[in-house]
C-alpha cells in the first residue's frame, strides 16, 4: 500500500485520536500548554484535556522520534521533524503547518527555543527568488550582471583564532569558515578549535555529503524520553551529537534541556570557550554565531 501503517512508534500525535494503540498514552510525558481552561476549542492540535488537581489542563502527549528530517513551519521556524512541529503547535495552541520540506532558508535569528515568535504563513517564504536558494547568509543580488548569491561577510575585524573545519581546512577565525560556507554555498562546520592536525581524518571531517553532523537551529528539539530519570542527568539523545564541542553532553530530564560538562580548560554553554578566548561558536548548518 502507498500509505504508511498506523502507529509507527512513539506518539507523533496519534495518541489523542485513539489511533496509536502501540503504547499507553497515559504513560507518556506530558507537555502542558499555557491554557487555563480546557475544552475542545482551547485544547486543539492533538492536545487532550487531563485532570490536574482542581481543574483540567491541556496535555500534549508526543513521544517524538529524533530522526533529523527538517521541515519548515508556517511560523518561519525549522523543526527537527514533523512530529516536533506538531508538538509545538499543541504546546502553543497555535496552528503551525509544514510549508516546505527541509530547513527554512530565511533566518529570523531565532535560537533553539520552542518557537515563541508569532508568524503568518503567508509571510513566510524560503529565499528562492531569481537566484535559487541562497543559503549560509548569502544574499540574492538580482541587480548584478550575473545573477547569483552574493556573500557580504566581513571577517576583517576578527582576531586570530584558528579553527579546524569539516572540509579538512584550517581557518584563521570561525568567521572565515562562515565566509567559505557562504561563498561555496555548501555546509562547512567547525570541528574543533585550533589548526587541523595530521590526526584529523579528513574522511570523517564531513565533506558536503557527510550527513549533517550539526543541524540547523531547530525549534522544540528537546527529546522527551519515556525512561524515568527524574532529577537525574542522562545521556543526550543522538540528535544532539556534537552539541558539546569539548565536553560531555548531559540531558536533564526534569527541564528537558541539554547541558555540557566541559573538559578541563574549556568553558561556555557548548564548552567552546578557552580561557584566553571570547569566541562563542554554535556549530550549525546555516550559521555561526559570534558573541
Amino acid at each position: 500500500s502507498n500509505q504508511p501503517p498506523g502507529g509507527g512508534g512513539g506518539s507523533g500525535g496519534d495518541c489523542p485520536g485513539g489511533k496509536g494503540k502501540s503504547i499507553n498514552c497515559s504513560e507518556l510525558n506530558v507537555r502542558e500548554s499555557d491554557v487555563r481552561v480546557c475544552d475542545e476549542s482551547s485544547c486543539k492540535y492533538g492536545g487532550v484535556c487531563k485532570e490536574d488537581g482542581d481543574g483540567l489542563k491541556c496535555a500534549c502527549q508526543f513521544q517524538c522520534h529524533t530522526n533529523y528530517i527538517p521541515v519548515c513551519g508556517s511560523n518561519g521556524d525549522t523543526y527537527q521533524n514533523e512530529c516536533f512541529l506538531r508538538r509545538a503547535a499543541c504546546k502553543h495552541q497555535k496552528e503551525i503547518t509544514v510549508i516546505a520540506r527541509g530547513p527554512c532558508y530565511s533566518d529570523n535569528g531565532s535560537g533553539s527555543g520552542e518557537g515563541e515568535e508569532e508568524g503568518s504563513g503567508a509571510e513566510v517564504h524560503r529565499k528562492h527568488s531569481k537566484c535559487g536558494p541562497c543559503k549560509y547568509k548569502a544574499e540574492c543580488d538580482e541587480d548584478a550582471e550575473n545573477v547569483g548569491c552574493v556573500c557580504n561577510i566581513d571577517c576583517s575585524g576578527y582576531s586570530f583564532n584558528p579553527v579546524c573545519a569539516s572540509d579538512g581546512s584550517s581557518y584563521n577565525n570561525p568567521c572565515f569558515v562562515r565566509e567559505a560556507s557562504c561563498i561555496k554555498q555548501e555546509q562547512i562546520d567547525i570541528r574543533h578549535l585550533g589548526h587541523c592536525t595530521d590526526t584529523d581524518d579528513t574522511s570523517l571531517l564531513g565533506k558536503k555529503d557527510d550527513g549533517l553532523q550539526y543541524r540547523p537551529d531547530v525549534k522544540d528539539a528537546s527529546d522527551q524520553r519515556e525512561d524515568v530519570y527524574i532529577g537525574n542527568h542522562m545521556p543526550c539523545p543522538e540528535n544532539l551529537n556534537g552539541y558539546c564541542i569539548h565536553g560531555k553532553c548531559e540531558f536533564i530530564y526534569s527541564t528537558q534541556k541539554a547541558s555540557c560538562r566541559c573538559e578541563s580548560g574549556y568553558t561556555g554553554q557548548h564548552c567552546e570557550k578557552t580561557d584566553f578566548s571570547i569566541l562563542y561558536v554554535v556549530p550549525s548548518r546555516q550559521k555561526l554565531t559570534h558573541v
Epitope: Q63, H65, N81, G102, L212
Partner: antibody, heavy 121, light 107 residues
Framework: QVQLVESGGGVVQPGRSLRLSCAAS????????MHWVRQAPGKGLEWVAV????????FYVDSVKGRFIISRDNSKNTLYLQMNSLRAEDTAVYYC??????????????WGQGTLVTVSS | DIQMTQSPSSLSASVGDRVTITCRAS??????LAWYQQKPGKVPKLLIY???TLQSGVPSRFSGSGSGTDFTLTISSLQPEDVATYYC?????????FGQGTKVEIK
C-alpha cells in the same frame, strides 16, 4: 504493487568504485525515506545509509562515512549508492528499503531483492 | 551510537514450544523497535513495529513487548516455517542499527 529493484552490483578490485541503483515503483517515491542495508555472506544485517525525501538530509554508518554517497533522483524514482575506495569488508548483498518518517516513524515494510557486491583482487 | 544486543545468538526448540528472543538497547529508544524475520536465501520481512504492533499478514503467534531499553519477541507456538534468523532494529534516529541476529532452529 510496490517494487524495489537493485542493480549495479558485481566484482570490483579494492580501492575502486561502484555505483548501485534502486528503481522504485508502485508508490509515491517522494513520500518515503530510502535506505541501503547490507549483509555480508553468512553475517547479519547492517544498516548503511538513508536519504530523506527531498535529498538534503543524509546519514551514514560510521564505517562508510567519507567513502559512500547516497543520493536520489525523485524525477526518476531512483535511489543511488556511490561506493568509493572499496574494501574487502564491503563485500555484501546490498538491499534498498523504504521507510516512512513524518509525524511518526515506521521501519522497513518493503525491501528490494538485493544486489551482490564482491570486492576482491 | 546506540548499540542493539540480541540474545541468544541461536536456539533450538521443538515444534509447539514457546520461544522468546530478547533485544536490549544501550540507551532508551522509547518503542521505536522493529523485529524482522529472514529465512535462508530470502529478503528480510517485517514482523513487528512500534515494539508490539503486528505487521499486516503476520501470524498472531508472533508478538512483541517492551519499551525503553528492553524488548522481547515471542513465538507462542513454534512452527516448522518459523525456522529463520530474527533481527531487532531501532529506528528512532540514525543510525538505524540492527541487533546481531538470533538463529532459530527446530530440534
Amino acid at each position: 504493487q510496490v517494487q524495489l529493484v537493485e542493480s549495479g552490483g558485481g566484482v570490483v578490485q579494492p580501492g575502486r568504485s561502484l555505483r548501485l541503483s534502486c528503481a522504485a515503483s508502485g508508490f509515491t517515491f517522494t513520500s518515503y525515506g530510502m535506505h541501503w542495508v547490507r549483509q555480508a555472506p553468512g553475517k547479519g544485517l547492517e544498516w548503511v545509509a538513508v536519504v530523506w525525501y527531498e535529498g538534503s538530509s543524509k546519514f551514514y554508518v560510521d564505517s562508510v562515512k567519507g567513502r559512500f554517497i547516497i543520493s536520489r533522483d525523485n524525477s526518476k524514482n531512483t535511489l543511488y549508492l556511490q561506493m568509493n575506495s572499496l574494501r574487502a569488508e564491503d563485500t555484501a548483498v546490498y538491499y534498498c528499503a523504504r521507510a516512512y518518517c513524518g509525524g511518526d516513524c515506521y521501519p522497513f515494510d518493503y525491501w528490494g531483492q538485493g544486489t551482490l557486491v564482491t570486492v576482491s583482487s | 551510537d546506540i548499540q542493539m544486543t540480541q540474545s541468544p545468538s541461536s536456539l533450538s526448540a521443538s515444534v509447539g514450544d514457546r520461544v522468546t528472543i530478547t533485544c536490549r538497547a544501550s540507551q532508551g529508544i522509547s518503542n521505536y523497535l522493529a523485529w524482522y524475520q529472514q529465512k535462508p536465501g530470502k529478503v528480510p520481512k517485517l514482523l513487528i513495529y512500534a515494539a508490539s504492533t503486528l505487521q499486516s499478514g503476520v501470524p498472531s503467534r508472533f508478538s512483541g513487548s517492551g519499551s525503553g531499553t528492553d524488548f522481547t519477541l515471542t513465538i507462542s507456538s513454534l512452527q516448522p516455517e518459523d525456522v529463520a534468523t530474527y533481527y531487532c532494529q531501532k529506528y528512532n534516529s540514525a543510525p538505524w542499527t540492527f541487533g546481531q541476529g538470533t538463529k532459530v532452529e527446530i530440534k
